[in-house]
């Protein structure tokens, strides 16, 4: 039975050329996380594996940094980075939990950041 919930940073905006942290947090479940996948639309950005650690997809190596925690840092943002991002938690025995974040990259020098939450 899937009892868990995923909190995310929600809808966020950032300035072109800047960086942003994408974060998800799985709570309310005793399931064990074995892997977290980060995806942009249908493209795999990175994998954080409980045993093997981080793997960043080669095409994103220059602009994606692992962490903090199970989160992902996107750097040197471009307008093309605007879109949906997904954290996919693989858990035993619950299965997969998916969180959604929408990122808008603004040309303007005044990018309004959505509310951030801190992972305890």
């Amino acid at each position: 039975m899937m009892t868990g919930t995923i909190e995310t940073t929600g809808n966020i905006s950032a300035e072109k050329g800047g960086s942003i942290i994408l974060q998800c947090h799985l709570s309310s479940t005793t399931a064990q996380v074995t892997q977290v996948n980060w995806e942009q639309q249908d493209q795999l950005l990175a994998i954080c594996n409980a045993d093997l650690g981080w793997h960043i997809s080669p095409s994103f190596k220059d602009r994606v940094a692992p962490g903090p925690g199970l989160g992902l840092t996107l750097q040197s943002l471009t307008v093309n980075d605007t879109g949906e991002y997904f954290c996919i938690y693989h858990t035993y025995p619950d299965g997969t939990y998916t969180g959604r974040i929408f990122l808008e990259v603004l040309e303007s020098s005044v990018a309004e950041h959505g509310a951030r939450f801190q992972i305890p």
Partner: antibody, heavy 122, light 106 residues
Framework: EIQLVQSGSELKKPGASVKVSCKAS????????MNWVRQAPGQGLEWMGW????????TYAQGFTGRFVFSLDTSVSTAYLQISSLKAEDTAVYYC???????????????WGQGTMVTVSS | AIRLTQSPSFLSASVGDRVTITCRAS??????LAWYQQKPGKAPKLLIY???TLQSGVPSRFSGSGSGTEFTLTISSLQPEDFATYYC????????FGGGTKVEIK
């Protein structure tokens, strides 16, 4: 080599307690969930539940609550099964089994202990 | 709980035979199914996971297929060391095992 080594056979009287150990080696113990499986003589496999090796949180299958306790000592990469108030019907082989695979598509019990025979008899 | 029904419970076959074992789930489990082989006095051994993926080191005469509620394990040419009991297991939710299929020498 990845392996799970369990403690030896036990002969116990009804009402007594037993603690079975399962020592892991060759992999990162806290990265893989651990399960316990019972097999009564001449019977099939019965999933007893599992323990989150990262948090120590146990989950028990129906019929295995109350007298059964799963625990860990991560410092020695060992999982434990304790059964209290033993009954004749607890006579069985008890296995520990690791969940292998990283994504949900790959989950399966890929490494098993050799089994511990627990006999309950007066 | 999801129930798994294996058939047949017993199967008599000869070396070289093609053997098929069926596992039916009481509700859809996608491809979250594994097959194990168990010999007397030994622990079960993983043969196949994700319904059709062969575990490393397992001979290619073993194959699995199916999704949803119906699954099969096939041994293309039975070898002397294949006489054993076979179990299916679902991992769609809390794991459960099928009742087992004992493959005996004819």
């Amino acid at each position: 080599e990845i392996q799970l080594v369990q403690s030896g056979s036990e002969l116990k009287k009804p009402g007594a307690s037993v603690k079975v150990s399962c020592k892991a080696s060759g992999y990162t113990f806290t990265s893989y969930p651990m399960n316990w499986v019972r097999q009564a003589p001449g019977q099939g496999l019965e999933w007893m539940g599992w323990i989150n090796t990262n948090t120590g949180n146990p989950t028990y299958a129906q019929g295995f609550t109350g007298r059964f306790v799963f625990s860990l000592d991560t410092s020695v990469s060992t999982a434990y099964l304790q059964i209290s108030s033993l009954k004749a019907e607890d006579t069985a082989v008890y296995y520990c089994a690791r969940v292998g695979g990283y994504s949900v598509d790959e989950y399966a019990f890929d490494v098993w202990g050799q089994g511990t025979m627990v006999t309950v008899s007066s | 709980a999801i129930r798994l029904t294996q058939s047949p419970s017993f199967l008599s076959a000869s070396v070289g035979d093609r053997v098929t074992i069926t596992c039916r789930a009481s509700q859809g489990i996608s491809s979250y199914l594994a097959w194990y082989q168990q010999k007397p006095g030994k622990a079960p051994k993983l043969l196949i996971y994700a319904a059709s993926t062969l575990q490393s080191g397992v001979p290619s005469r073993f194959s699995g297929s199916g999704s949803g509620t119906e699954f099969t394990l096939t041994i293309s040419s039975l070898q002397p060391e294949d006489f054993a009991t076979y179990y299916c297991q679902q991992l769609n939710s809390y794991p459960t095992f099928g009742g087992g299929t004992k493959v005996e020498i004819k």
